[in-house]
């Protein structure tokens, strides 16, 4: 029951994960940067791995997909790697779990056949999870370098200037949805490991007995007939069992023999 | 890199008009904000107005309102500043400003025009 319920459990958290993990790749909001003119001219920029949006304070927004733009950085091309991966492998693990799952019948699938399909689906959701959390810190750690990076003023040769405006790149809502939603896959993913050690059939440890065959010695009597089966009090049919000094298990673990006589 | 030219300047009598362009050329990913600023000898450099290239939102500085317009064409990357009923104070280096996303996840840059003089007489 309580593998079950762990199963389940793992499924459910990971499903949430996954969900939360495509969510964060496909939002807007990785990145948001504030850039005040004034009031009325108020521009705020948000970045996904996709596209880039402005905002201004009169309403209007406007995106620009990033295949307009050449030379995207190197990062956010590994950053879109990981989220891809991520979801692959969760949606194979998911559908994996499915089956897998204890409380679901399909066909005559051994429990062996499950234990093993359980692990698989929480190592993929290990991996899952791993790779999502690692794209959104990749990505974290590229608005924090960029940020420190860009600082000084420049000239240009035209007589203008061109100086740096202190705009703050902030975290965005995507990269927190990111965080929660690869630590929920990973979660999900351990769960399904315990689960499969719970749904593996467990070896019975017997304990070697070795059984020999009685000899069948019936007497006949005028009184009728008895049949000696060699466990019996026929003490001249009677095998003697030494085995020497034998655990409590041994003694009450002889399986009992019907003759029909 | 982005550059600014501005262009349109000129002598011209109180209550004339006045016409002042600024082209925006070179790579960039958004432009955000294009204004005008205006600096007189031994004074601060004052935004006069400003427009975003997106929804085409306006500011307008108290003292120009009613006279001045700004527009923009983004399919030029022009921004204009359109004068009218022009004041001796008004006289001043006007300078185009750029408000520009020139790559991603990098900080804005804060483009300047060299400026163009506006002279107006009594």
């Known amino acids: 029951m309580a593998v079950t319920a762990c199963q389940g459990l793992g499924f459910v958290v990971s499903l949430i994960g996954i969900a939360g993990i495509i969510a964060a790749t496909c939002m807007d909001q990785w990145s948001t940067q504030d850039l005040y003119n004034n009031p009325v001219t108020a521009v705020f920029n948000y970045q996904g791995l996709w596209r880039s949006c402005v905002r201004e304070s009169s309403g209007f927004t406007e995106c620009r997909g990033y295949f307009t733009l050449l030379g995207l950085p190197a990062m956010l091309q590994a950053v879109r790697a990981l989220m891809i991966v991520g979801i692959v492998l969760g949606a194979i693990g998911l559908l994996v779990s499915i089956f897998a799952l204890k409380c679901i019948r399909i066909g005559s699938m051994e429990d062996s056949a499950k234990a093993n399909m359980t692990l698989t689906s929480g190592i993929m959701f290990i991996v899952s999870g791993l790779c999502a959390i690692a794209g959104v810190s990749v990505f974290a750690n590229m608005l924090v370098t960029n940020f420190w990076m860009s600082t000084a003023n420049m000239y240009t040769g035209m007589g203008g200037m061109v100086q740096t405006v202190q705009t703050r790149y902030t975290f965005g809502a995507a990269l927190f949805v990111g965080w929660v939603a690869g630590g929920l896959t990973l979660i999900g993913g351990v769960m399904m490991c315990i689960a499969c050690r719970g749904l593996a059939p467990e070896e019975t440890n017997y304990k070697a007995v070795s059984y020999h065959a009685s000899g069948h010695s019936v007497a006949y009597k005028p009184g009728g007939f008895k049949a000696s089966t060699g466990f019996g009090s026929n003490t001249k049919n009677k095998k003697i069992y030494d085995g020497g000094a034998r655990t409590e298990d041994e003694v009450q673990s002889y399986p009992s023999k019907h003759d029909y006589v | 890199a982005v550059q600014l030219v501005e262009s349109g300047g000129g002598l011209v009598q109180a209550g004339g008009s006045l016409r002042l362009s600024c082209v925006a050329s070179?790579?960039?990913?958004?432009?955000?904000?294009m204004g005008w600023y205006r600096q007189t000898p031994g004074k601060q450099r004052e935004l006069v107005a400003d427009?975003?290239?997106?929804?085409?939102?306006?500011y307008y500085v108290d003292s120009v309102k009613g006279r001045f317009t700004i527009s923009r064409d983004n399919a030029k990357n022009t921004v204009y500043l359109q004068m009218i009923n022009l004041k001796p104070e008004d006289t001043a280096a006007y300078y185009c400003?750029?408000?520009?996303?020139?790559?991603?996840?990098?900080?804005?840059?804060?483009?300047w025009g060299q400026g163009t003089l506006v002279t107006v007489s009594s």
């Open positions: 400003q750029a408000n520009v996303l020139e790559a991603l996840f990098r900080p804005n840059l804060e483009v």
């Open positions: 070179g790579s960039w990913f958004r432009i955000q904000t």
């Open positions: 427009i975003t290239t997106g929804g085409g939102s306006t």
